[in-house]
């Protein structure tokens, strides 16, 4: 998957753009925004009818480093008695997020952006039966 | 992607930082195995706490469409398919890394940015607040 | 043909291990969650373990949590069912059985049945 | 748990006869109950789920009624072919998939 070129016509490449070699592209990682904070509602991974637990994977060759997935507590969703109704469904809300891979190659190091699928949390929806054709 | 040669003393001088910028291929690797977005796709309307989806579109960044969710009701819908009030419909919010041009307008020169998104909805039980 | 073939059974000691197969064939097999249920020789239907499309979501009779792990293989069309620390009472035919709900997703009702695997757990 | 007890046990009718089988759960399970029909020697199919539906392929002659707690299962007119044991399945509460004890119809 290739980064498209700026498509617009009235976009024209300005003079200032630095010259980058042929089939790659500079990539500044000071990130903007790097403080802007979350301000989700309080606890809703514990909340919600379909609650998730949160782990954090960690990989030193990866920009940032750390990634929190969110893994879906139980199959089904927890009824106002607080059991398991399995008549629905804990899923899975994914979103694809870049992140910066680190390759090394002998004493050499080359830089990939990657897509990945972050599981955020997750969502309680109503099965639907599968019709054979 | 593009080989950055080390100092002569590579094995002993690791750097466990990245550097502020560097050169990526052009080509971005997906990591996504084990998914397939059709199955997905439908959540938005099967959840009990449905939401709208709203395309955000900006040509300065990759990848210039994003959906932002939109959580359809207050409450959370029921057995019955009201809207059931005694409990909260709330938003699902990521921190994304997405690229800008920078300096704008050029081709291949990026920034990364940290945005954030509403993926989907989820339904609460709500909080009693109680006051001192 | 649409069907599910398990094999694997067999007598085997208390204590000791067994793993199930199931080989699916004439459908989608990644469109589906699976399951396994057996059955105790003339008694009746016990659902021992079930996984959904891609593995994220799996679940276990009490019975058999901590001992049996279930797990997939959709390029292979398979499924598995890892035993362990085998009792007496987990003497059975055990049935790999397809969930009817769509996406791979849970709705907990078989619809195709393959015809089973006996397992005999004796010393 | 849940529990589910079907009744009765074994049912002695003839070809032609209409048979009412009985399910009675612990707690209510709504409408998501299931019958199953297992034949000797064969693997259980699906027969009725959610309370009313008739899975694919299965005769008109096969209803499934009730909800909450009480669930039947009627077959207007046995075949021979129908002369089975029946299973009901629940899929309303953790843990999932609990079934019933069965009912043996026979020939009388």
């Known amino acids: 998957r290739k980064i498209p070129k700026v498509g617009h016509t009235f976009f024209q490449k300005p003079e200032s753009c630095p010259p980058v070699p042929g089939g790659s592209m500079k990539l500044d990682i000071g990130i903007i925004n790097e403080n802007q904070r979350v301000s989700m509602s309080r606890n809703i991974e514990s909340r919600s009818t379909s609650p998730w637990n949160y782990t954090v994977t960690w990989d030193p060759n990866r920009y940032p480093s750390e990634v929190v997935q969110a893994q879906c507590r139980n199959l089904g969703c927890i009824n106002a008695q607080g059991k398991e109704d399995i008549s629905m469904n804990s899923v899975p809300i994914q979103q694809e997020t870049l992140v910066v891979r680190r390759k090394h190659q002998g004493c050499s190091v080359s830089f990939q952006l990657e897509k990945v699928l972050v599981t955020v949390g997750c969502t309680c929806v109503t099965p639907v039966i599968h019709h054979v054709q | 992607g593009i080989t950055i040669p080390r100092n002569p003393g590579c094995p002993n001088s690791e750097d466990k930082n990245f550097p502020r910028t560097v050169m990526v291929n052009l080509n971005i690797h997906n990591r996504n195995t084990n998914t397939n977005p059709k199955r997905s796709s439908d959540y938005y309307n099967r959840s009990t706490s449905p939401w709208n989806l709203h395309r955000n579109e900006d040509p300065e960044r990759y990848p210039s469409v994003i959906w932002e969710a939109k959580c359809r009701h207050l409450g959370c819908i029921n057995a019955d398919g009201n809207v059931d009030y005694h409990m909260n419909s709330v938003p699902i919010q990521q921190e994304i890394l997405v690229l800008r041009r920078e300096p704008p307008h050029c081709p291949n020169s990026f920034r990364l940015e940290k945005i954030l998104v509403s993926v989907g909805c989820t339904c609460v039980t709500p909080i009693v607040h109680h006051v001192a | 043909e649409v069907q599910l073939v398990e094999s694997g059974g067999g007598l085997v000691q208390p204590g000791r291990s067994l793993r199930l197969s199931c080989a699916a064939s004439g459908f989608t097999f990644d469109d589906y969650a699976m399951h396994w249920v057996r059955q105790a020789p003339g008694k009746g239907l016990e659902w021992v373990s079930g996984i959904n499309w891609n593995s994220g979501g799996i679940g276990y009779a009490d019975s058999v949590k901590g001992r049996f792990t279930i797990s997939r293989d959709n390029a292979k069309n398979s499924l598995y069912l890892q035993m362990n620390s085998l009792r007496a009472e987990d003497t059975a035919l055990y049935y790999c059985?397809?969930?009817?709900?769509?996406?791979?997703?849970?709705?907990?009702?078989?619809?195709?049945w393959g015809r089973g695997t006996l397992v005999t757990v004796s010393s | 748990e849940i529990v589910l007890t079907q009744s009765p046990a074994t049912l002695s009718l003839s070809p032609g006869e209409r048979a009412t089988l009985s399910c009675r759960a612990s707690?209510?399970?709504?409408?998501?109950l299931a019958w199953y029909q297992q034949k000797p020697g064969q693997a259980p199919r699906l027969l009725i789920y959610?309370?009313?539906n008739r899975a694919t392929g299965i005769p008109a002659r096969f209803s499934g009624s009730g909800s909450g707690t009480d669930f039947t299962l009627t077959i207007s007119s046995l075949e021979p072919e129908d002369f089975a044991v029946y299973y009901c399945q629940q899929r309303s509460n953790w843990p999932p998939a609990t079934f019933g004890g069965g009912t043996k119809v026979e020939i009388k």
């Open positions: 059985a397809r969930d009817m709900g769509g996406f791979g997703e849970f709705y907990w009702n078989f619809g195709l």
């Open positions: 707690q209510s399970v709504r409408s998501y």
């Open positions: 959610d309370a009313s």
